[in-house]
């Protein structure tokens, strides 16, 4: 829907002010080399056209060159993820350079003005980085352009200006009111770098979308579905802080992006995955894990550059917290009716034990329905690395523990009351790794008891390695 | 106010080669992508390509790479476009168009006919 | 390359009616949609851009919505001035694609 700014939503900028009133803007940007991940460290300020500053502060041509670009602010003042990611690339990076674009005073504005004031920014930043190409061994190869919401789109008209192809953008949850839909040279899109990676983790269907929610780089990466964020509720910022607000939450859900990258950063050894999916409620249903043809990738900092012809949207889960990692898994059942149940939505758990630890209760989030008959797939994630799977423990819910089950339950009888017995059949779990890719098979531990009803649990060993079983054929529905 | 003034009607054999010119007025010449569009007589309209010329980067429609060439002169704020290896179905009206929300502003046109 | 395809291809229409024209998008392009109107002779006028915004100018009875693949332009109620032909155009990547173009005719 139209975003709720300006006359018609639409930008009054220089190609539309009348004549008499466009004037040159004197940008007010700065660059300042962060030569320390001391925040309070001032770093040296780069000016157009004067090669001294770049001496003094060691400015090393050869090495990688960040530019973090901050977006819209309310405070006019620099905000702490933007400290905490100067010393993650610092750490990562101990040689590169790393830039903060300070556009504080046109930034520190009513948004609709602060969005018009990005062209002038991006071609300040495409300016300067022009002028750095005059040096001898400086490359655009070597630029990565770091933009966190509004900063973002400052990125991608930066990358649009200069004269060449920046390295790569990696956009932070990129702005959505006003670019939602903008043309591809009005906002962050692939054509800005060699390679456009975007984390979305702020965007809604309904109401207001903080975050751009429509694909806008080579990659982009919708964690938790790109909307709710996991530690973000209102109950988590009421827990962690004196007054908790909405504001707080969209904070919270907004810059999750940038602590997504720094976690990246920071916890290389423990990298997060992407998958590619067309939508999220296909990967919550477990269906996309794969890592055939590019389909997975790193996630942040250590993404893969991919540059398909088409964009590719990827999905993951997260913690709450950092490290963000989890372990992905696809679960495939196969579930026998062995009497006609009628409409049935049973609430599964299951228990996965490894090697290493075994997992918390897991929810088997049902997104449409059971199919009867039918191999139904669905996601579950642990927070911890369960080592080598060995068995699984299925549980399906007994007494209600809520209105909405007791109302299931209920109308459940009235369409079969002379069925009190509910009862499936399932002889065995399919289950790929989304982190290793390694496909096993669970048996059922009683071959003679598949029979599953509420209040009862069954119990699944590994009984092979991959999926195919002995003598089986093309997958076909096996009744007894 | 932002306007775009292009070249007049061009004649050209099978073969040969059209430059069409759009002068720009009115904003900041060097920001804004300029795309060229043509329509064929009783057609619809068609992309070719454009061109940012601060940095005279250039996007180019598949079917004319190779055919088609944009420059721009920042000294007289014109950008061209050149045809090569004309064919009766380039006749067309050629504009050039100031691209920001969508393409907001246009050129008048520029008939090009090719005929033996 | 994405295809954009636009109808009906023509119609015709009287003064005070509500005139609707669909255009159709091969793949997902968001709302990234603007609408042109060409008059005989003339260059094309951006009317609306990113599917549902009236570009500067542009009388209100002129409104455009949908998102993904499926467009639509409305005109509330045809004035003599809007007898002319529509086009659609993806601005999400490029190439840029125009679809093929509505004639709106008076009846």
């Known amino acids: 829907s139209p975003t709720p700014f300006g006359p018609e939503g639409q930008l009054e900028d220089e190609l539309h002010k009348p004549k008499a009133i466009q004037t040159e803007v004197k940008p007010s940007v700065r660059f300042n080399l962060r030569t320390s991940k001391d925040p309070e460290h001032e770093g040296c300020y780069l000016s157009l056209g004067h090669s001294q500053p770049l001496e003094d502060c060691g400015f090393n041509m050869t090495a990688k060159t960040f530019f973090i670009i901050h977006g819209w602010t309310m405070s006019g003042i620099f905000e702490n993820w933007l400290h905490k990611l100067v010393s993650a690339l610092h750490t990562r990076e101990k040689d590169a350079n790393v830039v903060v674009v300070d556009w504080l005073p046109l930034a520190h504005q009513l948004y609709t003005d602060a969005v018009n004031n990005t062209r002038v920014v991006g071609h300040s930043i495409a300016r300067m980085l022009d002028w750095l190409q005059e040096k001898d061994d400086f490359s655009l190869e070597n630029v990565h352009l770091i933009g966190y919401s509004l900063g973002a789109h400052v990125a991608g008209y930066a990358g649009n200006f200069v004269k060449g192809t920046v390295g790569r953008i990696t956009g932070l949850d990129p702005a959505g009111p006003m670019f939602e839909g903008a043309d591809i040279h009005k906002r962050l899109s692939p054509d800005d770098a060699d390679f456009v990676d975007v984390l979305h983790t702020y965007t809604r269907s309904f109401g207001l979308s903080i975050g751009i929610q429509m694909p806008v780089g080579h990659i982009d990466i919708y964690p938790n579905g790109g909307d709710f964020q996991p530690g973000c509720g209102l109950n988590d910022v009421l827990g962690s802080m004196a007054y908790g607000t909405i504001t707080e939450v969209v904070k919270c859900e907004h810059e999750r992006a940038v602590h997504l990258f720094v976690d990246s950063l920071v916890n290389q050894d423990k990298p997060s995955f992407a998958f590619q999916c067309t939508d999220s409620n296909r990967f919550k249903k477990g269906i996309c894990l794969s890592c055939r043809k590019n389909r997975c990738n790193s996630i942040g900092y250590n993404a893969k550059k991919m540059r398909n012809k088409r964009n590719s949207k990827m999905y993951l889960k997260t913690r709450a917290g950092m490290p963000f990692r989890v372990y992905h898994y696809q679960m495939k059942i196969h579930v026998f009716s062995y009497k006609n149940m009628g409409e049935i939505e049973p609430t599964f758990y299951v228990t996965l034990y490894g090697t290493n630890a075994d997992s918390q209760t897991l929810p088997l989030e049902i997104v449409e329905r059971i199919e009867q008959n039918a191999t139904n797939t669905f996601l579950v994630y642990t927070e911890e690395d369960l080592g080598d799977l060995l068995k699984i423990q299925l549980t399906w819910e007994g007494a209600s523990q809520s209105w909405y089950n007791l109302w299931k339950e209920l109308r459940s009888y009235l369409s079969q009351p002379h069925n009190p017995g509910r009862e499936l059949n399932i002889r065995r779990i399919r289950v790929k790794s989304g982190e290793t890719q390694r496909k096993l098979t669970f048996c059922a531990e009683d071959p003679e008891n598949t029979s599953i009803s509420p209040g009862r649990e069954l119990w699944f060993r590994k009984c092979r390695d991959g999926w195919r079983m002995k003598n089986e054929t093309s997958p076909t529905v096996e009744l007894p | 106010q932002v306007q775009l003034v292009q070249s007049g009607a061009e004649v050209k054999k099978p073969g040969a080669s059209v430059k069409v010119s759009c002068k720009a007025s009115g904003y900041t010449f060097t920001t804004y992508w300029i795309a060229w569009v043509r329509q064929a007589p009783g057609q619809g309209l068609e992309w070719m390509g454009e061109?940012?010329?601060?940095?005279?980067?250039?996007k180019y429609n598949k079917k004319f790479k190779g055919r088609v060439t944009m420059t721009r002169d920042t000294s007289t704020s014109t950008v061209y476009m050149e045809l090569s290896s004309l064919r009766s179905e380039d006749t067309a009206v050629y504009y050039c168009a100031v691209y920001d929300y969508g393409a907001d502003y246009w050129g008048q046109g520029t008939t090009v006919t090719v005929s033996s | 390359d994405i295809q954009m395809t636009q109808s009906p291809s023509s119609l015709s229409a009287s003064v005070g009616d509500r005139v609707t024209i669909t255009c159709k998008a091969s793949q997902d392009v968001y709302t990234a949609v603007a609408w042109y109107q060409q008059k005989p002779g003339k260059s094309p006028k951006l009317l609306i851009y990113?599917?549902?915004y009236r570009f500067t100018g542009v009388p209100s009875r002129f409104s455009g919505s949908g998102s993904g693949t499926d467009f639509t332009l409305t005109i509330s109620s045809l004035q003599p001035e809007d007898f002319a032909t529509y086009y659609c155009?993806?601005?999400?990547?490029?190439?840029?694609?125009f679809g093929g173009g509505t004639k709106v005719e008076i009846k």
């Open positions: 061109i940012l010329p601060g940095s005279a980067k250039t």
């Open positions: 990113s599917a549902s």
């Open positions: 155009q993806q601005h999400y990547s490029i190439p840029r694609t």
